[in-house]
Interface confidence: medium
């Protein structure tokens, strides 16, 4: 039975050329995580393996920096990355576990500093 | 040269126990997951075990969780599947297979041809 | 467990048609869908991976589409050596599970 939650970071905002820490925590399950997926609506963007470490998808290598921990960093925002964003814990013996980030890139200086795992 | 060749199927009784092998070729082992998948005579695929490329991580199916353990030998290239308490229902054509990488897990690219393994008194 | 049900069982064509095998899982698999096929007496072959993209060697004939609960797999314009099982897997989550196969026979 899958009893973990997975608590995240939920809407956020940045502001174009910035950066932005996406960050997921798995909770209430003692399963093992070995791998996490992040992704773009159904585009991935890195991959953290256990045994394998960090690998970042080609397309992104300049603007993704792995870190910290299982989180995703994400640099030199633009207007196009605002959009939904997914953690997907591969555990054993639970199964998956799938969270979700919205991030909208604000032009402007507007943009909220509330969020917990904001990079200023 | 098929890069993934398993043995040591065969007939044995109810009960009984045996260790399949399956030795690899022509591409870095350590570096990926294994899994092994087998098929009853004229039935469809039901996936076994699967094990990570350092050997720290094993998955089991239900139905043979208990009974049957998967192990690996990177220096020798090598899968190993520890078959015990057999029954009936374990009879079936037994492949490994190599995940097909980094970010594809639980995807096969590369099957072995099979080892067949009969369980009956 | 996540259950994967495809259809049809079995499909009879002829060279040249325009075959789709479809494939629904249990629960939102996202682009986690692989598809294989098999020959009788041989192990199975992947053809597409992540839903879409096509195994290096696969010819292009074949193709794969869906998201969430929903997947095809295409074949364009059937040639002789594409009569076999196919076989849709999901590669989301442990345990990986296997749709029942499709059968394609020769009209």
């Known amino acids: 039975m899958m009893t973990g939650t997975i608590e995240t970071t939920g809407n956020i905002s940045a502001e174009k050329g910035g950066s932005i820490i996406l960050q997921c925590h798995l909770s209430s399950t003692t399963a093992q995580v070995t791998q996490v997926n992040w992704e773009q609506q159904d585009q991935l963007l890195a991959i953290c393996n256990a045994d394998l470490g960090w690998h970042i998808s080609p397309s992104f290598k300049d603007r993704v920096a792995p870190g910290p921990g299982l989180g995703l960093t994400l640099q030199s925002l633009t207007v196009n990355d605002t959009g939904e964003y997914f953690c997907i814990y591969h555990t054993y013996p639970d199964g998956t576990y799938t969270g979700r980030i919205f991030l909208e890139v604000l032009e402007s200086s507007v943009a909220e500093h509330g969020a917990r795992f904001q990079i200023p | 040269q098929v890069p993934l060749v398993e043995s040591g199927g065969g007939l044995v009784r109810p009960g009984g126990s045996l260790r399949l092998s399956c030795a690899a070729s022509?591409?870095?082992?350590?570096?990926?997951?294994m899994s092994w998948i087998r098929q009853a005579p004229g039935k469809g695929l039901e996936w076994v075990s699967y094990?990570?490329?350092?050997?720290?991580?094993?998955y089991s199916a239900d139905s043979v969780k208990g009974r049957f353990t998967v192990s690996r030998d990177n220096a020798k290239s090598s899968l190993l599947l520890h078959m015990n308490s057999l029954r009936a229902e374990d009879t079936a054509i037994y492949y490994c297979?190599?995940?097909?990488?980094?970010?594809?897990?639980?995807?096969?690219?590369?099957w072995g041809q099979g080892t067949l393994v009969t369980v009956s008194s | 467990d996540i259950q994967m049900t495809q259809s049809p069982s079995s499909l009879s064509a002829s060279v040249g048609d325009r075959v789709t095998i479809t494939c629904r899982a249990s629960?939102?698999?996202?682009?986690?869908l692989t598809w294989y096929q098999q020959k009788p007496g041989k192990a199975p072959k992947l053809l597409i991976y992540?839903?879409?993209s096509l195994q290096s060697g696969v010819p292009s004939r074949f193709s794969g589409s869906g998201s969430g609960t929903d997947f095809t797999l295409t074949i364009s314009s059937l040639q002789p050596e594409d009569f076999a099982t196919y076989y849709c897997?999901?590669?989301?989550?442990?345990?990986?599970?296997f749709g029942q196969g499709t059968k394609l026979e020769i009209k």
């Open positions: 897997q999901q590669s989301y989550s442990i345990p990986c599970s």
């Open positions: 094990i990570s490329s350092s050997g720290s991580t094993v």
């Open positions: 992540t839903a879409s």
């Open positions: 297979a190599r995940d097909r990488g980094f970010g594809e897990s639980y995807c096969f690219d590369y």
């Open positions: 022509g591409f870095t082992f350590s570096d990926y997951y």
């Open positions: 629960q939102n698999i996202r682009s986690y």
